[in-house]
Each structure stands twice: as C-alpha cells, then as structure tokens.
Interface confidence: low
Amino acid sequence: EEELQVIQPDKSVLVAAGETATLRCTATSLIPVGPIQWFRGAGPGRELIYNQKEGHFPRVTTVSDLTKRNNMDFSIRIGNITPADAGTYYCVKFRKGSPDDVEFKSGAGTELSVRAKPSAPVVSGPAARATPQHTVSFTCESHGFSPRDITLKWFKNGNELSDFQTNVDPVGESVSYSIHSTAKVVLTREDVHSQVICEVAHVTLQGDPLRGTANLSETIRVPPTLEVTQQPVRAENQVNVTCQVRKFYPQRLQLTWLENGNVSRTETASTVTENKDGTYNWMSWLLVNVSAHRDDVKLTCQVEHDGQPAVSKSHDLKVSAHPKEQGSNTAAENTGSNERNIY
C-alpha cells in the first residue's frame, strides 16, 4: 500500500479580520494510526493550534467528525481572525507511539494572510496659530491595517496637495501596519472656512476610502486691518472718531483708545459682524470733547488681537481749527514702526 501523504490543497488563504479561516487538510490513507495536530510555523518554535487527541482550543472547530474511524479530512476552522493570526499553518500526522506519539508526515503548509481595515485617519495640526502666507504642517495617522499596501492622499478644499511625506511602519514584515504622513499647507487670508483632508485607501475598504479632517479655523490667525476716521461733529465742542477693525480671526480682540498717549478707554470686541470668508469686522468710537484740550490731540486706536503684540493707528485732531471745519477730514496718520496695515 502507498505511504500516507498529508495534502494541504491551499497554498494560501486570505481572510478579513473578524471572519473565520478554513484551513483544509486531508490524508491519503488511514494507516498509520495516530492523531493529527495543526501548528503555526515550523521548527522548534512552532505554535500548537489544534491537537486532535487532547487540549482545549476554543477558537478551533473541525470541519468533519474526527471521531469517525474512516475519517481522512482533518480541515479546521479558526474563528474571529486577527492580524496576529497571520502565518503558515502546517497539518502534521503523528504515528501512535509509546510513551509519546511520533511525528510522521507534515503537509506543505498553508499561508494565512489577514486583511485588516485601517483605523479612521486622525488629522492634527500645529499647536499654535499661524498667519496667512506661512506654511504649517498637518499630520495624519492610521493604524492596524494589513496587508501593507496603502494609499494616502491630502486635500485642501478638494484640491489635492503634493507637498507631503509618508511612512508606513514597521519597514519589515509585520502582522499589521501603521501609516504616518506630514503635509505642508500654505495659509491664505481666505482659509477660515477651509478644510484639510487626509484620505486613506486600502484593499479592505472596497473603494470607499476613509477620511480624516482638520478645520483651518483652528490653525489660522488673520490679523486685523485698522482705519481711524473722524466723523462729522455732533455738537459744537465734540468730535466723534471711529476705529474700524476689519477682517480679523479669531474673534478674541481688545481695543484701547489713547489720547496723547494716555489710556482713555479699553473694550473687548463683542457685537462683531461676520464676513462671508469667516473673518470678523468691528467698530469702536470715541467722543472727544475738543474744548477740554488746549493743544492738538493725537488719538490712537490700539488693538491687541488673539494675544499678539498690539497694532495701532493714529489720527491727529487739530484743536486750533474750528471743529466744524474738521468734520469731513478723514485723513489718518500712521504711527511709526508698530503699525500693521494689511489691506
């Protein structure tokens, strides 16, 4: 009679994480008598997966009834597969022996590959806000996927970005992988409503990529532009001066009026108006009693935006001239080096 052969017909089996893997194995003969064992890996470090004779293997079930005398099908099913289960599985026939059974013949092995979905990409931006024209970095991370092949793309408002660097770790073989990507994005003044998107495509996602997003509203700081104007007189000795604070983001803003360098009033932006691009406008006014001043008055509107160094704009009020003659004078005088006007 021909010697027993152990047949593992599947060279490889591909299973999605969470599913059940079927590993097929048949023997060509009932002789010699002895049990079958399944191992992951070969050699002295191999891991026992199933022993027909003894032991408790809660995740393993046999395809056929191994208690039947004429059974030659030793296929098994392994439930709730995870990436850690990947490897080569061997069906090994043992010959009954005393005191221990002796390994008789092994199948050629079946490689189990596990497909695992990547986790939802997490996008994180810089710790501190940045102003338009600056380049900021965003990172995107996704974990736990297998096989290693994966595609990552970056978008800003639907436009694909090209300036990014991606790593898939570990570089060698592993049961599952992680991807880490850093993209560089140049901010513009219109980016308050913008979004950065990281898109991950993987074989397990069946053409429906995963996306992670970051809102640039959490990253951008748009500094205000200031304009100080003098309004027509309300009364004989009173002049109304307004400070228009335009196109700023975020809303956190404090304004101080100075008369000849002395603090006159400080207020915090509250009832702001929102522009279409997401930035804000605000206006503050100061009623100046001209008769209280003997000399010309230098009025300064000083703005501290989002904790940044103050920017200011000044206006000269000439007391010597009659207030009514100044009613339509809107000329604003720039201060020196501390002025920031971006129109």
Epitope: N167, D169, P170, V171, E173
Partner: antibody, heavy 119, light 107 residues
C-alpha cells in the same frame, strides 16, 4: 562566503558628484536590501538610504533627498550610490551593507570607500 | 523621525568587568533594535538583531534586552578584543537611525 567589495577611494572638488559601487557575492543578491551608511571622520554612523535589490524599491533619508541616487544592476550583483553637489562636509567613509527584509539589520558590511571633498 | 539616544557616550572598564550600554528610542519601536561593534578603521559588525537575538559567530558574553523604548547591551566578562565603539540602530521606521555611539576604553 558572503562578501561586499566596494570601489576605491575618491577625491572630488566641491560641486562635483561621486559614484560608489558595491559588488555582492556569496548570496542571492535579489533576496536582500542594500543600505548605504556614511561616517564623517570622528563621528557616528548616518543612514543614507536603501534599495531592495529584488524590486528596486528605494527609500532615501530626507537629509540626502535630491542629492543621492541609489541604483542596482542585478546581472552584475552590484549596487551603486551616487552623491551630487558635493561639499566639504561630505568628506566621509561610505559603507554599503546587506539588509535583512524583516528587521532591517545590516549583517554584512563592505570595507568602506573614503570620499574626500576638497578644493 | 525616531531619535535614538545612547548612554554613556564613553566608559572605562577593565578586562573581566561586566559592562552595560543603554539605548532609548523617542517612541515605541517594539523589538526593532540592533547593536553593532566598530573598531578604528574598520566597518561596523552586527552583534545583536531584534533587540536580543545574538548574531551567528558572536560570543555569548554579548547579550541584548529590552522592548518598546528602552534597550540595553551587556558584555559579561569584558575581553581585550571588546574595546571598541558600540552603536544601537532602530529599524522600525525610516529614516533608519543610529545612536551616537559608546566608546568602551581600557581603564
């Protein structure tokens, strides 16, 4: 036995390019990666990049991106590393080293090629 | 990028001493850490791969341990031929990176 034989020492002027070769023998060339590592005199080891000899997949260190080119010729079982726009700080010993595909350790090293950049 | 910090940068020891060199990675790298020995004018030589696996032909007085971020190389009973510079290298993520080296000198 497994051996990596590197090309001889080079003296180059700033702005020039250098191409170092690494001839492998004693193993299946396409079964491993080939790393390039350099060592500036008196300093530590610095990884430049690798090429997977089987499929020619290449990875460069960001520091050398744009200046380094790693190639291989499977029929000659030889890997090459070309560094362009040389400057004096590129004066170093350049090593090729065979890389494992799992842990990416470097188990066999060439003797090194000294590249001197001087005007 | 993963930084690998090696300590000490140098040490003096006598023949027969037990020497330990440590290596710390800036993030978890599992067991993807390798150790090399380099003598002046020579190429580095692989001692240990995968944190603790002794490379074929390397004397058993060398041993490696650790996982995650903290690793160590121990030389039991230092021999005259062991005076050299030792480097650790992470191979978890590109760019692959080496520690700054530890020079083991004769006391």
């Amino acid at each position: 036995q497994v051996q990596l034989v590197q090309s001889g020492a080079e003296v180059k002027k700033p702005g020039a390019s250098v191409k170092v070769s690494c001839k492998a023998s004693g193993y299946t060339f396409t079964s491993n990666a080939m790393h390039w590592v350099r060592q500036v005199p008196g300093q530590g080891l610095e990884w430049m990049g690798w090429i997977k000899a089987g499929n020619a997949e290449i990875k460069y260190s960001q520091k050398f991106q744009g200046r380094v080119t790693i190639t291989r010729d499977t029929s000659a079982t030889t890997a090459y590393m070309e560094l362009s726009s040389l400057r004096s700080e590129d004066t170093a010993v350049y090593y090729c080293a065979r890389g494992d595909y799992y842990y990416y350790y470097m188990d066999v090293w060439g003797k090194g090629t000294t590249v001197t950049v001087s005007s | 990028d993963i930084q690998v910090t090696q300590s000490p940068s140098s040490l003096s020891a006598s023949v027969g001493d037990r020497v330990t060199i440590t290596c710390r990675a800036s993030q978890s790298i599992s067991d993807f850490l390798n150790w090399y020995q380099q003598k002046p004018g020579k190429a580095p030589k692989l001692l240990i791969h995968a944190a603790s696996s002794l490379q074929a032909g390397v004397p058993s007085r060398f041993s490696g341990s650790g996982s995650g971020t903290d690793f160590s190389l121990t030389i039991n009973s230092l021999q005259p031929e062991d005076f050299a510079t030792y480097y650790c290298q992470q191979s978890y993520s590109t760019p692959l990176s080496f520690g700054g080296g530890t020079k083991v000198e004769i006391k």
